[in-house]
């Protein structure tokens, strides 16, 4: 069952999945100047059994200017409904992720892959949040959200993260500070542009988390 909505956006934070549940779809998209080949797949699909999962279909692009040359790329179909867009991720993933049954790893990038990926998540998917560079985290609980099915409708749970003040970057345990992305410029002068690569799986929150001065509610 596909999740109806994107994971909730939190101010000055980004989210990422460490692994993708079977049934997850990744749109085949190309960077500017490339397009999906006519017979090419629209998306990659995480499939498998209890012992092994992998991405079915391969995204292929051709140069918009060239008819015959094809390249393996994540293509960019005409812009669809904005959905589950994450910044381009590093193929380097934690080892534990590969052993998660019923999950696929982050697909490695291809030449000329678009800088954003659009995922269609399924029920049970978990995503993790971290503050962008220049903001620090105040936690009341796990900085994660899970897509759950309740009364026939899907909903992402509330991530307990507040990114406040232009201060130290919040990171997951053992993670190096993210580097500013060379890709493009921020959309405003106040943007903090940072990639969300190389997240570490966070199985539990650090015992020394700051007490949040914030309270959260559902509206």
């Amino acid at each position: 069952e596909l999740c109806d909505d994107d994971p909730p956006e939190i101010p000055h934070a980004t989210f990422k999945a460490m692994a993708y549940k079977e049934g997850t779809m990744l749109n085949c998209e190309c960077k500017r100047g490339f397009r999906r080949i006519k017979s090419g797949s629209l998306y990659m699909l995480c499939t498998g059994n209890s012992s092994h999962s992998s991405w079915d279909n391969q995204c292929q692009c051709t140069s918009s200017a060239t008819r015959n040359t094809t390249k393996q790329v994540t293509p960019q179909p005409e812009e669809q409904k904005e959905r589950k867009t994450t910044e381009m991720q590093s193929p380097m993933q934690p080892v534990d992720q590969a052993s998660l049954p019923g999950h696929c790893r982050e697909p490695p990038p291809w030449e000329n892959e678009a800088t954003e990926r659009i995922y269609h998540f399924v029920v049970g998917q978990m995503v993790y949040y971290q503050c962008v560079q220049g903001y620090r985290a105040l936690h009341r609980g796990p900085a994660e959200s899970v897509c759950k099915m309740t009364h026939g409708k899907t909903r992402w749970t509330q991530p307990q993260l507040i990114c406040t003040g232009e201060m130290e970057t919040s990171q997951f345990p053992g993670e190096e500070k993210p580097q500013a992305s060379p890709e493009g410029r921020p959309e405003s002068e106040t943007s903090c542009l940072v990639t969300t690569t190389d997240f570490q799986i966070q199985t539990e929150m650090a015992a020394t988390m700051e007490t949040s001065i914030f309270t959260t509610e559902y509206q």
């Epitope: 909505d5 994107d6 000055h12």
Partner: nanobody, 118 residues
Framework: DVQLVESGGGLVQPGGSLRLSCAAS????????MSWYRQAPGKERELVAY????????TYTDSVKGRFTISRDNAKNTVYLQMNSLKPDDTAVYYC???????????WGQGTQVTVSS
């Protein structure tokens, strides 16, 4: 062009109420988390409240909890901050912020002055 235009600020007596509005244009409003920040003279800008994208989770700083309410109307591309039981400490310039993680979007309004004084 992206625009965030705040309105509704003004001078109010302690215990009074104001409703701030932030009208957004130039981006897909429903795909952005919306928040209100404030900055008092000589102090750092602080997060007051935010509301996520669907399903619209809200978060408040403790100093305004129970007094302020943030809400959004995706059909009108507008976010609101209802401020009740105002105190002199609430005096500040209030800024509206729109945020999306990827593709990156981080937009700020010009601010609206709120003064609580007798």
């Amino acid at each position: 062009d992206v625009q965030l235009v705040e309105s509704g600020g003004g001078l109010v007596q302690p215990g009074g109420s104001l409703r701030l509005s932030c009208a957004a244009s130039g981006f897909t409003f429903s795909s952005y988390a919306m928040s209100w920040y404030r900055q008092a003279p000589g102090k750092e800008r602080e997060l007051v409240a935010y509301i996520t994208t669907s399903p619209g989770y809200t978060t408040y700083t403790d100093s305004v909890k129970g007094r302020f309410t943030i809400s959004r109307d995706n059909a009108k591309n507008t976010v609101y901050l209802q401020m009740n039981s105002l105190k002199p400490d609430d005096t500040a310039v209030y800024y509206c912020n729109a945020w999306r993680g990827a593709p990156r979007g981080d937009y700020w309004g010009q601010g609206t002055q709120v003064t609580v004084s007798s």
